[in-house]
């Protein structure tokens, strides 16, 4: 007899979730020599332990601590790239600029990128039918708490000059409610981080505005400055050219002349 299962508003766990996490872990540790010591079965067990048998609206950051401990990784100073609502370009950038890292270039971020998961209270089953939606159901769900936890940790360990890519096409270029605005900004450590440099990505050729003067960017500058971290901002008017010049920095068309 099928058991009664709570119906949530969000989509269910990504199909083949355990296999996907395990396969990603194996792939990551093969490609990154500094993480070869990681036991992927232990990583999966810690991941599973964070949400299996737990009420999916009552997940805490504490639940993910065993996983965070296993996935401990450091980014060299000046090499952290944060992003907000412009994930694809940020990832295209770090795929080319291999010495810079987004959260999704780190083991834990790589494992969970684009995946959804949740369990059920008092059963060992994974819920493939539905999972809590952040707005409609609850914010303390397995996925949201995971990203909050690893984002906090990622920001806390950053040092030197930290970069952030922001979407200039959004009405709120800097959104205090985004993961960057609500978690990462507040967890940069002033004693380790000298500056935050924002790259505001423009959406089209018609947009000649200096988006670094946008009120939300000024708000970000204020928050950062109050935390004794210097703030810089740069317009990226042409993201296609930006990526091209990252790939081909010596090309004459990439040397400042305009």
């Amino acid at each position: 007899v099928p058991r009664w299962r709570q119906q949530w508003s969000g989509s269910g766990t990504t199909s083949r979730f355990p296999e996907t996490v395990l396969a990603r872990c194996v792939k990551y540790t093969e490609v990154h020599p500094e993480m070869r010591h990681v036991d992927c079965q232990s990583v999966w067990d810690a991941f599973k332990g964070a949400f299996i048998s737990k009420y999916p609206c009552n997940i805490t950051e504490e639940d993910y601590q065993p996983l965070v401990k296993l996935g401990t990784q450091t980014v060299p100073c000046n090499k952290t790239l944060l992003w907000s609502r412009i994930k694809d370009l940020a990832h295209q950038f770090t795929q080319v600029q291999r010495d810079m890292f987004t959260l999704e270039d780190m083991l834990l971020g790589y494992l969970a990128d684009d995946l959804t998961w949740c369990g059920e209270f008092n059963t060992f089953e994974i819920n493939y039918q539905s999972c809590p939606d952040w707005r409609k159901d609850c914010s303390n769900n397995p996925v949201s708490v995971f990203w909050k936890t690893v984002s906090r940790r990622f920001a806390e360990t950053a040092c030197g000059v930290v970069h952030v890519m922001l979407n200039g096409s959004r009405s709120k270029i800097f959104d205090k409610n985004s993961t960057f605005g609500s978690v990462e900004v507040h967890n940069l450590q002033p004693e380790k981080v000298q500056a935050l440099e924002a790259w505001v990505i423009h959406g089209g050729r018609e947009d000649s505005r200096d988006l670094c003067q946008d009120p939300t960017i000024k708000e970000l500058e204020s928050i950062i400055s109050k935390r004794n971290i210097r703030f810089f901002c740069k317009n990226i008017y042409r993201p296609d050219k930006f990526l091209q010049c990252v790939k081909n920095p010596e090309d004459s068309s990439c040397l400042s002349g305009i």
């Epitope: 089209g204 050729r205 018609e206 000649s208 740069k234 317009n235 990226i236 008017y237 042409r238 993201p239 296609d240 050219k241 930006f242 091209q244 010049c245 081909n248 090309d251 068309s253 990439c254 400042s256 002349g257 305009i258």
Partner: antibody, heavy 123, light 107 residues
């Protein structure tokens, strides 16, 4: 040496179509925005259309919007302008021009031009 | 769109003399202005960009100045090959726009 060579111009009746080509050489074609600029006989320069590095963004002057289509083939180092529903006022020499673009600086000029191809729209 | 107005329409100058061409924008274009030279039957040639930077291979007798809405192209000592039509172009706001041109002719 940077070279831009236009072709495809000629005499066409009003309402007709024409496809212009511009063969580029001497530089990495995909690293530059490209534009078409026209010049009616005895008149000044008028920007017509532009295309981004990979052809995913296209822009048109109001006077040609909906009638002209710009495109590029980076594998062939060639820029195109498909001109439909031609009018007498489209009669001009059409130049293809290269735009050096910077990612962190808005706007650009035309640093190299082709010799142009004459399009005459007349019955 | 930004309207570019050049003056005078025609400038008559003797070889060896100084020529001063003006270009006015209907609104500020900062320093995002280029100057081109066009001789009969030829394509335009870039002379100046960024209002004052000479393009590669352009002789020092050509100089540009100005910012905002008022710009000047100066040819310090006109040579025979300088008699041509000169156009300004703004690239501060989309779409890019040209002035109507100034013809520099032999006096």
């Amino acid at each position: 040496e940077v070279q831009l060579l236009e072709s495809g111009g000629g005499l066409v009746q009003p309402g007709g179509s024409l496809r212009l080509s511009c063969a580029a050489s001497g530089f990495t074609f995909s690293f530059y925005d490209m534009s078409w600029v026209r010049q009616a006989p005895g008149k000044g320069l008028e920007w017509v259309s532009a295309v981004s590095l990979y052809g995913d963004e296209t822009y048109y002057a109001d006077s040609v919007k909906g009638r002209f289509t710009i495109s590029r083939d980076n594998s062939k180092n060639t820029l195109y302008l498909q001109m439909n529903s031609l009018r007498a006022e489209d009669t001009a020499v059409y130049y293809c021009a290269r735009e050096p673009v910077s990612y962190d600086y808005y706007g650009s000029y035309f640093d190299y031009w082709g010799q142009g191809t004459l399009v005459t729209v007349s019955s | 769109e930004i309207v570019m107005t050049q003056s005078p329409a025609t400038l008559s100058v003797s070889p060896g003399e100084r020529a001063t061409l003006s270009c006015r924008a209907s609104q500020s274009v900062s320093s995002n202005l280029a100057w081109y030279q066009q001789k009969p039957g030829q394509a335009p040639r870039l002379l100046i960009y960024g209002a004052s930077t000479r393009a590669t291979g352009i002789p020092a007798r050509f100089s540009g100045s100005g910012s905002g809405t008022e710009f000047t192209l100066t040819i310090s000592s006109l040579q025979s090959e300088d008699f041509a039509v000169y156009y300004c172009q703004q690239y501060n706001n989309w779409p890019w726009t040209f002035g109507q041109g100034t013809k520099v002719e032999i006096k």
